[in-house]
Interface confidence: medium
């Protein structure tokens, strides 16, 4: 796969994943629960990171936000933080990667600058994806271990709601948002990895492109006291050599204009 294709695909995959992370964060169905189920009426409670909702088979639906921070579990706060961090990093990653795309020319930005930006955006996407996956997994663990509070207990900090305590500890099941979050986090992670791989293709590898020219002129002798500097580049002061024009010539033969290069 070409570098441009890898970079472009990585960007698109990350973009889709990022959109999924936002969707999962905003969704109400992080956990679902059958409150009441009989042949006449079914009542479902589903909770998100920001609000709790109730839906009945009759069509009635009501959602209410968590207006307080005091009554909310610390784990829920942590999940919120992880998802927000993931979104913020994703936004930065997208902005950076737009400028890093090889197919987009911005001024005189060279490949090495684009490579650095591609790597940066790739790392940002990877961290963003990891944040989302961890956030969703922490929430899922809360459900599995039955740590999640009952509907009534969720609002204990909201102006006298503490009196509303359900005696039965209710078990919630995984909501759609968890699966969206896992997939989205995975896609963002994969996209980030692809961006990092594309970065390697964009980076000019110095070790592979050290150009050493061979001249027919009489100025260059076969042997110098400093070692085989002219022919092999392993002279005593080779450490300070710079590469010009993508490895076209070394500092030592800056004045000469060779016609043929050997890459060692």
């Amino acid at each position: 796969m070409s570098v441009t294709a890898c970079q472009g695909l990585g960007f698109v995959v990350s973009l889709i994943g990022f959109a999924g992370i936002i969707a999962a964060t905003c969704m109400d169905q992080w956990s679902t629960q059958d409150l009441y189920n009989n042949p006449v009426t079914a009542v479902f409670n589903y909770q998100g990171l920001w609000r709790s909702c109730v839906r009945e088979s009759s069509g009635f639906t009501e959602c209410r936000g968590y207006f307080t921070l005091l009554g909310l579990p610390a784990m829920l706060q942590a999940v919120r933080a992880l998802m927000i961090v993931g979104i913020v990093l994703g936004v930065i990653g997208i902005l950076v990667s737009i400028f890093a795309l090889k197919c987009i020319r911005i001024g005189s930005m060279d490949d090495s600058a684009k490579a650095k930006m591609t790597l940066t955006s790739g790392i940002l996407f990877i961290i963003s994806g990891i944040c989302a996956i961890i956030g969703v997994s922490v929430f899922a663990n809360m459900l599995v271990t039955n740590f999640w509070m009952s509907t009534a207990n969720m609002y204990s900090g909201m102006g006298g709601m503490g009196g509303m305590v359900q005696t039965v500890q209710t078990r919630y099941t995984f909501g759609a948002a968890l699966f969206v979050g896992w997939v989205a986090g995975g896609l963002t992670l994969i996209g980030g990895v692809m961006m990092c791989i594309a970065c390697r293709g964009l980076t000019p590898d110095d070790s592979n492109f050290k150009a050493v020219s061979y001249h027919a002129s009489g100025q260059n002798v076969a042997y110098r006291p400093g070692g085989f500097k002219a022919s092999t580049g392993f002279g005593s002061n080779t450490r300070n050599k710079k590469i010009y024009d993508g490895g076209a010539r070394t500092e030592d033969d800056e004045q000469s204009h060779p016609t043929k290069y050997d890459y060692v």
């Epitope: 109730v54 609002y155 102006g159 709601m161 305590v165 039965v168």
Partner: nanobody
Framework: EVQVQESGGGLVQAGGSLRLSCAAS????????VGWFRQAPGKEREFVAA????????NYADSVKGRFTISRDNAKNTAWLQMNSLKPEDTAVYYC???????????????WGQGTQVTVSS
């Protein structure tokens, strides 16, 4: 702590009307949805109607749709159940309850009144 108290029950002829009131004490009344439930002798408690905390949405049992109307005034800490075209089968003890959602699920409601008797004679 919120406390609710129903009033307005009584004996009425079939086809008649009654208006039940639910008065709540406590500043947090506006935080709660208000639900009305009823229990006839020898039967389970059943959902009648509910109104959301803001009054913006209502929920009715199929058996009372079009006949009963629920409303509230948060400034007065009061909710009402206007019952029209009453039938003998509407005879029951009517309970007012405060909960987080205006759902038909009685487990959602944490605060309950003592109930008021409504009798519809044929």
């Amino acid at each position: 702590e919120v406390q609710v108290q129903e009033s307005g029950g009584g004996l009425v002829q079939a086809g008649g009307s009654l208006r039940l009131s639910c008065a709540a004490s406590g500043r947090t009344f506006s935080n709660y949805a208000v639900g009305w439930f009823r229990q006839a002798p020898g039967k389970e408690r059943e959902f009648v109607a509910a109104i959301t905390w803001s009054g913006g949405s209502t929920n009715y049992a199929d058996s009372v749709k079009g006949r009963f109307t629920i409303s509230r005034d948060n400034a007065k800490n009061t909710a009402w159940l206007q019952m029209n075209s009453l039938k003998p089968e509407d005879t029951a003890v009517y309970y007012c309850a405060g909960g987080f959602f205006a759902t038909s699920y009685s487990g959602n409601y944490g605060y309950w009144g003592q109930g008021t008797q409504v009798t519809v004679s044929s």
